[in-house]
C-alpha cells in the first residue's frame, strides 16, 4: 500500500484512506473491517526480508 | 478550548435542501476525522456520515446515502453537510462531532447541535 | 449491521446510589464499545471509550467494563448531576458506527 507522494508505508502497516496514515497491520485481527486491512493482505508480514537488495 | 458550531438549521419543504456548517476551533482541525451525527425529536442517535482528515475518504448512513453529502474545508476549519430531497423522517437536531487522536474509535467533542425540521 | 441494545431502557435511583446500565452487541465486538451522557437539550458528553478508559475530565465514579457482546456502565454514587440519557457506541465496524437506544436515568 501506498502513501500520498508514492511514500511507502513501512513493513507491517498499510495505508489508511479513512485515516489518511499509516496502520499497524497488528490490529486487523482484532477488527478486520478497517479499510487498510485490505493492504495487509496483500503486503508481506512484518518479519518478511528480501533476499536480495 | 476546543469548540464546535453548527449552523445552517431551519425549516425546510419536503424535496428541498440545506446546507449545514460546523465551524472548529481550539484544535487543529486537519488531522481529524469528523462525523454528522442525528437526533430525532425525543429519539436515540444516530450517526449519518464519516469524512476522513483530508477529505478523501467518506461514507454514509444508507438512510441518507445518494441525498446527503458531507465535506470539509480545512483552510477554513469548517465541516459541511449538504443535505437534498430532504424527507419528513429527516427532521433532527443533527451533531458534528470530533474523532479521537489515534483512530476515530471515539468522539471526544461535539457541537451544540442544529435543528432540522422538514415540513409542508 | 451490528445492534446495540441497552437495558433498561429507563430507571429511577436516588442520590447516592449504585447504578448500573449494560449494551449488549449483536455479534462480538472485542472491546470497542464508548459510553456517552446527554442531557436534555445538550450534546452528547464522552465518558468512557475502548470499554473502560475514563475520558479526560469525567468523575472516578464512571467506571465501564466489559469485552465481546457484553458491556457494562457503573456509577458508584449517583450524583443530582448525573440524571440524563446514557448511550453506548460501537465502534468496531468504524467509520460505520451503531449506538444502543439509550437509558434515561431519573429521580427516584
Known amino acids: 500500500e501506498q502513501a500520498p507522494g508514492n511514500a511507502p508505508c513501512s513493513s507491517g502497516s498499510s495505508w489508511s484512506a479513512d485515516l489518511d496514515k499509516c496502520m499497524d497491520c497488528a490490529s486487523c485481527p482484532a477488527r478486520p473491517h478497517s479499510d487498510f486491512c485490505l493492504g495487509c493482505a496483500a503486503a508481506p508480514p512484518a518479519h518478511f526480508r528480501m533476499l536480495w537488495p | 478550548e476546543v469548540q464546535l458550531l453548527e449552523s445552517g438549521g431551519g425549516l425546510v419543504q419536503p424535496g428541498g435542501s440545506l446546507r449545514l456548517s460546523c465551524a472548529a476551533s481550539?484544535?487543529?482541525?486537519?488531522?481529524?476525522?469528523m462525523i454528522w451525527v442525528r437526533q430525532a425529536p425525543g429519539k436515540g442517535l444516530e450517526w449519518v456520515s464519516y469524512?476522513?482528515?483530508?477529505?478523501?475518504?467518506?461514507h454514509y448512513a444508507d438512510s441518507v446515502k445518494g441525498r446527503f453529502t458531507i465535506s470539509r474545508d480545512n483552510s477554513k476549519n469548517t465541516l459541511y453537510l449538504q443535505m437534498n430531497s430532504l424527507r419528513a423522517e429527516d427532521t433532527a437536531v443533527y451533531y458534528c462531532?470530533?474523532?479521537?487522536?489515534?483512530?476515530?474509535?471515539?468522539?471526544?467533542?461535539w457541537g451544540q447541535g442544529t435543528l432540522v425540521t422538514v415540513s409542508s | 449491521d451490528i445492534q446495540m441494545t441497552q437495558s433498561p431502557s429507563s430507571l429511577s435511583a436516588s442520590v447516592g446510589d449504585r447504578v448500573t446500565i449494560t449494551c449488549r452487541a449483536s455479534q462480538s465486538i472485542s472491546g470497542y464499545l464508548n459510553w456517552y451522557q446527554q442531557k436534555p437539550g445538550k450534546a452528547p458528553k464522552l465518558l468512557i471509550y475502548q470499554a473502560s478508559s475514563l475520558q479526560s475530565g469525567v468523575p472516578s465514579r464512571f467506571s465501564g467494563s466489559g469485552s465481546g457482546t457484553d458491556f457494562t456502565l457503573t456509577i458508584s454514587s449517583l450524583q443530582p448531576e448525573d440524571f440524563a440519557t446514557y448511550y453506548c457506541?460501537?465502534?468496531?465496524?468504524?467509520?460505520?458506527?451503531?449506538f444502543g437506544q439509550g437509558t434515561k436515568v431519573e429521580i427516584k
Open positions: 457506541q460501537q465502534s468496531y465496524t468504524s467509520p460505520f458506527i451503531t
Open positions: 469524512i476522513s482528515p483530508s477529505g478523501g475518504s467518506t
Open positions: 481550539g484544535f487543529t482541525f486537519s488531522p481529524y476525522p
Open positions: 462531532a470530533r474523532g479521537g487522536d489515534t483512530y476515530f474509535d471515539y468522539f471526544d467533542y
